[in-house]
């Protein structure tokens, strides 16, 4: 729990450099996100494909989309879960991180120092050991997050099943109902290829209790979709006289010393025809 208060932002006096004053874990061990670069990567043959169970949500069901002042969050059902980790991890919510229209590079994790346009996090909790995500969030092995790197490219109809509701959650505290859809459609191709490491929540209280799975391959959304995400939302309540745009809601990469990130894929460079001369 924070030492006092719970106000934090991505910019200004309450920005990430100040998080550790109120949330000590933010200045502690195993912090996320990180840069994924070749020196720290190690292939691990035991990292088998994950199975995504109960991800196909019925459109007859309603799911709550919320502007929490930091991101846009979609509540997920507890019978949606990942199979293939040491315990069952049940879904609790997904949310996104992004940049701004002038610098649309707002992913949290970077690859070889490069940001992607945005990043999706699907948060799960260890439901074998804990009754809910809140209880699990500060416990060892408590959380497992799937991270999807998002790049600008072609229109993505699956992501639009979230983005089409953004106008109803423009301000902090606003909530809307979203019809269920297949959450697996938000994942990239070849989900068997991923990075794995132990880290933390990327927002306060920054608990170092997250088993991260960052998929190697990005998904694409269109420039228009990205712009909608970057311009639709505010961090402030509707009646706030000083509205703040919800932009650049990503944490800087953290130190990652004397540790490894494990990959489910071997780092084989594909030779192109041009590279053979």
């Amino acid at each position: 729990a924070p030492v006092n208060g719970s106000k934090w932002t991505y910019f200004g006096p309450d920005g990430e450099n100040s998080w550790s004053k109120k949330y000590p874990s933010c200045g502690g061990l195993l912090q996320s996100p990180i840069d994924l670069h070749s020196d720290i990567l190690q292939y691990d043959a035991s990292l088998t494909p994950l199975e995504f169970q109960g991800y196909n949500l019925s459109a007859n069901k309603q799911f709550l989309l919320t502007n929490n002042g930091h991101s846009v969050k979609l509540n997920l059902p507890s019978d949606m879960h990942i199979q293939g980790l040491q315990s069952r991890y049940s879904a609790t919510q997904l949310h996104l991180h992004w940049g701004n229209p002038n610098d649309p590079h707002g992913s949290e994790h970077t690859v070889s120092g490069q940001h992607f346009a945005a990043e999706l996090h699907i948060v799960h909790y260890n439901s074998d050991l804990y009754p809910d995500a809140s209880t699990a969030s500060n416990k060892s092995e408590g959380l497992a997050v799937l991270a999807v790197l998002i790049e600008m490219g072609s229109f993505n109809p699956s992501y639009d099943k979230i983005f089409s509701h953004l106008q109803h959650v423009k301000y902090k505290g606003q909530e809307a109902f979203v019809p269920g859809f297949n959450i697996e459609e938000l994942l990239p191709e070849r989900t068997a290829e991923y990075y794995r490491y132990r880290g933390s929540l990327t927002t306060p209280p920054c608990n170092p209790t997250v088993l991260w799975t960052v998929f190697r391959n990005p998904v694409q959304i269109s420039q228009e979709q990205l712009l909608a995400l970057e311009t639709a939302l505010y961090c402030t309540h509707m009646d706030d006289p000083s509205p703040r745009e919800m932009i650049n809601n990503f944490r800087q990469v953290q130190k990652f010393d004397e540790r490894l990130v494990y990959t489910s894929f071997s780092q084989v460079q594909v030779c192109t025809a041009a590279g053979l001369s």
Epitope: S58, A59, N60, K61, Q62, L64, P77, S78, D79, Q167, H168, Q174, E175, A176, F177, P179
Partner: antibody
């Protein structure tokens, strides 16, 4: 035939609690959420909350959070609404209802007959 | 919360009259739904997605509108249409209903 049947209404003392039941039949119970909606005498309709019978996940109207609890017994195809600290203003007909998706959003296609709760000393 | 204001609250009309009920939302909504309720009975779905009639609803009923302003129209009022009509939005949490419009016999 798809049916929802409420029961459990009656006279309750102020400060007391109620537990209403909503028994469903005629469809695959876990495929649809169950909503509770109430209607005070001569007034409009007000949503209380809903439950997903497949997993017991609940969502409430903020107005009723902490005072209303919705639960489910899948083996009986029955949802329950418990409300505590009742006041005269909670006097209403309580309906359960099922929303169906039609391609963009939902509408309530099936309603129970309603059960009247009167809060009075 | 999105407030839904129906007007008029009640109206008296004769059989054969054209009747229009308005529902105004305090913020923009994607679709409006309408329900019909008769005394002592549960509401019945009547119009969904602003303009689609529920199966069995006579074609003299129609719905239209967008954004914040929506209407339900009965082109030629029939005796069985005397009831209370409620609008409802599902765009934002909490989902909300209008206060109702009672259509009475003149």
């Amino acid at each position: 035939e798809v049916q929802l049947v409420e029961s459990g209404g009656g006279l309750v003392q102020p400060g007391g609690s109620l537990r209403l039941s909503c028994a469903a039949s005629g469809y695959s119970y876990t495929d649809y959420n169950i909503y509770w909606v109430r209607q005070a005498p001569g007034k409009g309709l007000e949503w209380v909350g809903y439950i997903d019978p497949a997993n017991g996940d609940t969502t409430y109207n903020q107005k009723f959070k902490g005072r209303a609890t919705i639960s489910v017994d899948k083996s009986k195809n029955t949802a329950y609404l418990q409300m505590n600290s009742l006041r005269a203003e909670d006097t209403a007909v309580y309906y359960c209802s099922r929303p169906i998706y039609y391609g963009a959003y939902w509408y309530f296609d099936v309603w129970g007959q309603g059960t009247l709760v009167t809060v009075s000393s | 919360d999105i407030q839904m204001t129906q007007s008029p609250s009640s109206l008296s009309a004769s059989v054969g009259d054209r009747v229009t009920i308005t529902c105004r939302a305090s913020s923009s909504v994607t679709y409006m739904h309408w329900y019909q309720q008769k005394p002592g009975k549960a509401p019945k779905p009547w119009i969904y997605a602003t303009s689609s009639l529920v199966s069995g609803v006579p074609s003299r009923f129609s719905g239209s509108g967008s954004g914040t302003d929506f209407t339900l129209t009965i082109s030629s009022l029939q005796p069985e249409d005397f009831a209370t009509y409620y609008c409802q939005q599902w765009s934002s949490n909490p989902l909300t209903f209008g206060q109702g419009t009672k259509v009475e016999i003149k």
